[in-house]
Interface confidence: medium
């Protein structure tokens, strides 16, 4: 049943980096309008971006309330200028979207090499702690605050020279590698979750090289 | 364990407001919506609306929209109902009763009795 | 709003009887059914949610089921305790609605 000249949304799909999670579908709209309801699985429905022509929905406010609880949401079709009409059934036309957990699911967001530094034979490369749109105490958590010990980030580093790379791990936001001295070497890395089945890896960061502006090049 | 102890039996003159209570204990307040429910004398359960203590996001029930205001008081994890207007037909026992679910009360409070006579 | 009706609105049976009460949707509500009990001057019990899933502590003589739109609650062996009136609601639409009741009384 539902609303006569309306179309159900579909393709439900979760967007969602860091933990700004917005929910898209399909189709564009022609002479009718969406709302939005998400909860949780222990909550309620609460409806979001009423009667909009949009076709997606920013639903990070929601989410971050709770990043490890399992959220549903749905996208109801009323027709255009008349969204109290409704079918014979009395129940406008909606969809289901997938579950989604933000804490399993939200893409981890390209990683930004913040500084390296090198001392001697060692060299420090520093990650920088990203900031999430998840807020404790009124203040906004970092993408270490949340995941803690599950983030971990891979370094590939290799010699200006040559292409072999080799890797480090760190489950901070640090790395201290050994370097050959009078080397020049280029860094990128990746975030990575490893006890995820899915959405793991983020993508690389941007190459940075020794011997450009990033960073503080100290030879001791 | 979870427990909601709500305030004291009242008694309005017509039009008048009455404003009831509800103390949550033995779970995250802020995590679960409050909704509430009220039963006229040998009647049906009829649901009035329910707020989100996280944000005091509220959700009416079109027939008590303008004459009911939820509020919470997440300081002392206490849900309020106020409902103005009063007429005899608002003589009822009014419940708090926590959402678990869509829709779903699994928690509730003794409910309490509002006489409206004049 | 969606409503509810409820069938029969009371029924008479012994302990140990079998009793099934209905609850008939107006219009879809997914599997958002969920059924309480309720004692005079007691708040309502939850029983059943979900359709069929029965909540915790609650005694395994009742069950819930669905077929087609009408929701059935199910007591297998009645028993003392369980003479009171029972709602269905709904909790897949906003406004959430009961149905008017079902008075289980002692024959």
């Known amino acids: 049943s539902g609303t006569t000249n309306t179309v159900a949304a579909y393709n439900l799909t979760w967007k969602s980096t860091n933990f700004k999670t917005i929910l898209e579908w399909e189709p564009k709209p022609v002479n009718q309008v969406y709302t939005v309801q998400i909860s949780t699985k222990s909550g309620d429905w609460k409806s979001k971006c009423f009667y909009t022509t949009d076709t997606e929905c920013d639903l990070t406010d929601e989410i971050v309330k709770d990043v490890k609880q399992t959220y549903l949401a749905r996208v109801f079709s009323y027709p255009a200028g008349n969204v109290e009409s409704t079918g014979s059934a009395g129940e406008p036309l909606y969809e289901n979207s997938p579950e989604f957990t933000p804490y399993l699911e939200t893409n981890l967001g390209q990683p930004t090499i913040q500084s390296f530094e090198q001392v001697g034979t060692k060299v420090n490369v520093t990650v920088e702690d990203e900031r999430t749109l998840v807020r404790r105490n009124n203040t906004f958590l970092s993408l270490r605050d949340v995941f803690g010990k599950d983030l971990i980030y891979t370094l590939y580093y290799w010699k200006s020279s040559s292409s072999g790379k080799k890797t480090a791990k760190t489950n901070t936001n640090e790395f201290l590698i050994d370097v050959d001295k009078g080397e020049n070497y280029c860094f990128s890395v990746q975030a990575v979750i490893p006890s995820r089945t899915v959405n793991r890896k983020s993508t690389d960061s941007p190459v940075e090289c020794m011997g450009q502006e990033k960073g503080e090049f100290r030879e001791i | 364990q979870v427990q909601l102890v709500q305030s004291g039996a009242e008694v309005k003159k017509p039009g008048a407001s009455v404003k009831v209570s509800c103390k949550a204990s033995?779970?995250?307040?802020?995590?679960?919506?409050m909704h509430w429910v009220r039963q006229a004398p040998g009647q049906g359960l009829e649901w009035m609306g329910m707020i989100d203590p996280s944000d005091s996001y509220t959700s009416y029930a079109q027939k008590f929209q303008g004459r009911v205001t939820l509020t919470v008081d997440t300081s002392t994890s206490t849900a309020y109902m106020e409902l103005s207007s009063l007429r005899s037909e608002d003589t009822a026992v009014y419940y708090c009763?926590?959402?678990?679910?869509?829709?779903?009360?699994?928690?509730w409070g003794q409910g309490t009795l509002v006489t409206v006579s004049s | 709003d969606i409503q509810e009706t409820q069938s029969p609105s009371s029924l008479s049976a012994s302990v140990g009887d079998r009793v099934t009460i209905t609850c008939r949707a107006s219009?879809?509500?997914?599997?958002?059914l969920n059924w309480y009990q309720q004692k005079p001057g007691k708040a309502p019990k939850l029983l059943i949610y979900?359709?069929?899933r029965l909540h915790s502590g609650v005694p395994s003589r009742f069950s819930g089921s669905v077929s087609g739109t009408d929701f059935t609650l199910t007591i297998s062996s009645l028993q003392p305790e369980d003479f009171a009136t029972y709602f269905c609601?709904?909790?897949?639409?906003?406004?959430?609605?009961f149905g008017q009741g079902t008075k289980v009384e002692i024959k």
């Open positions: 219009q879809g509500i997914s599997n958002y």
């Open positions: 609601q709904q909790g897949n639409t906003l406004p959430y609605t």
């Open positions: 979900h359709t069929s």
């Open positions: 009763t926590r959402g678990s679910g869509p829709g779903l009360f699994a928690y």
């Open positions: 033995g779970y995250t307040f802020t995590t679960y919506w």
